[in-house]
Interface confidence: low
């Protein structure tokens, strides 16, 4: 088992993740581990020399870069917020701010926009991953209601009047809850006509 640096006539290295082909000397050299960079290139007699990334910089993968990448903050102008800080081995982890979704994606989210409101009688369909797409509003299922325009309000079950010792004065709809009344109270005048047999 050869240890870098070793000669390679076919321009490939045994461990593609941790080694790379150096064409000038036709040898395989070690890559630098995450969190480091190449401080001295390899030669036929000496392997790659690595150094730790300076503060506020990182390299995420085994690499043969001569510099570390600069840490970038999550840009609130683009609707992003930080969920994990930058380390020498990992860039700053960002996500869309609450109430926003990712509108532009280039390897990672670059721009978030505000979620659309769902109108009364509907709710946002639950997604596997928060912030991945705009709201898709779906009607409240039977026996449920939602009475606001909101990106996040959920449909709630209609009140069951009998559970409160009351009777139903008006049935619930997708946009309004059931109206309950004391069984001893008369119906309001505008509704009394509907009860004629």
């Amino acid at each position: 088992q050869a240890v870098p640096p070793y000669a390679s006539e076919n321009q490939t290295c045994r461990d593609q993740e941790k080694e790379y082909y150096e064409p000038q000397h036709r040898i395989c050299c070690s890559r630098c581990p995450p969190g480091t960079y190449v401080s001295a290139k390899c030669s036929r007699i000496r392997d790659t020399v690595c150094a730790t990334c300076a503060e506020n910089s990182y390299n995420e993968h085994w690499n043969y870069l001569t510099i570390c990448q600069l840490c970038r903050p999550c840009d609130p102008v683009m609707g992003l917020e930080e969920i994990a800080p930058c380390t020498s081995k990992r860039k700053t982890q960002c996500r869309c701010q609450p109430g926003m979704f990712c509108a532009a994606w280039a390897l990672e989210c670059t721009h978030c926009e505000l979620l659309s409101d769902c109108p009364p009688g509907t709710e946002a369909e639950l997604k596997d991953e928060v912030g991945k797409g705009n709201n898709h509003c779906v009607p409240c299922k039977a026996g449920h209601f939602q009475n606001t325009s909101s990106p996040s309000a959920r449909c709630q079950p209609h009140t069951r009047c009998e559970n409160q010792g009351l009777v139903e004065a008006a049935p619930g709809t997708a946009q309004s809850d059931t109206t309950c009344k004391n069984p001893l109270e008369p119906l309001p005048p505008e509704m009394s006509g509907t009860m004629l047999m």
Partner: antibody
Framework: QVQLVQSGAEVKKPGSSVKVSCKAS????????WSWVRQAPGQGLEWMGR???????NYNPSLKERVTITADESTSTAYMELSSLRSEDTAVYYC?????????????WGQGTLVTVSS | DIVMTQSPLSLPVTPGEPASISCRSS???????????LDWYLQKPGQSPQLLIY???YRASGVPDRFSGSGSGTDFTLKISRVEAEDVGVYYC?????????FGPGTKVDIK
Amino acid sequence: QVQLVQSGAEVKKPGSSVKVSCKASGGTFSSYFWSWVRQAPGQGLEWMGRFYSGGSANYNPSLKERVTITADESTSTAYMELSSLRSEDTAVYYCARERRGYSGGFEIWGQGTLVTVSS
Amino acid sequence: DIVMTQSPLSLPVTPGEPASISCRSSQSLLHSNSYNYLDWYLQKPGQSPQLLIYLGSYRASGVPDRFSGSGSGTDFTLKISRVEAEDVGVYYCMQPLQTPFTFGPGTKVDIK
């Protein structure tokens, strides 16, 4: 139709603070960015900072230590407070609502509040 | 900070004639989402500014179609196809790509 109504003109002494209000009527307050822009007499426009109704704010570094932007969502009112006032802070201060889902695009403006700093 | 420049700073116009204002930014305003983050505003005498164009070329609601925005990257243009008397005022470009948002110095448009 949304309207932004700002508080009245103020005269302040150097070193003091001023707090300007901006009340939104006729539309939702939440889920928008609210910016403040100022204009010194006969000069151009300077962006001061912005507030997202979710609670985050960012400021112009030239004013960062002195400006605070807040909001009271229950009254649909945004506030801009500027401290350690100096004569060069004499300006008309505008609040503006940004286009929904877009950075910038100040689509609705308040009428402006003149703040005069004079000893 | 991104520095915005405009030219000309003063523009005398004739009603019915076209007019054009240039705006340059010190760095590209073209975002990876393919939109140019540039706005145009008009401040009429004694009034608050009003949004004319956003994202470089999108007319704001209620803005007459004689106003158009074009350009990409660092060079942008606002065109008025036929100037009307009500178009007088100071025109500002602004970049909302990065905070702090920055405005151009303004172009004063008045009738010859």
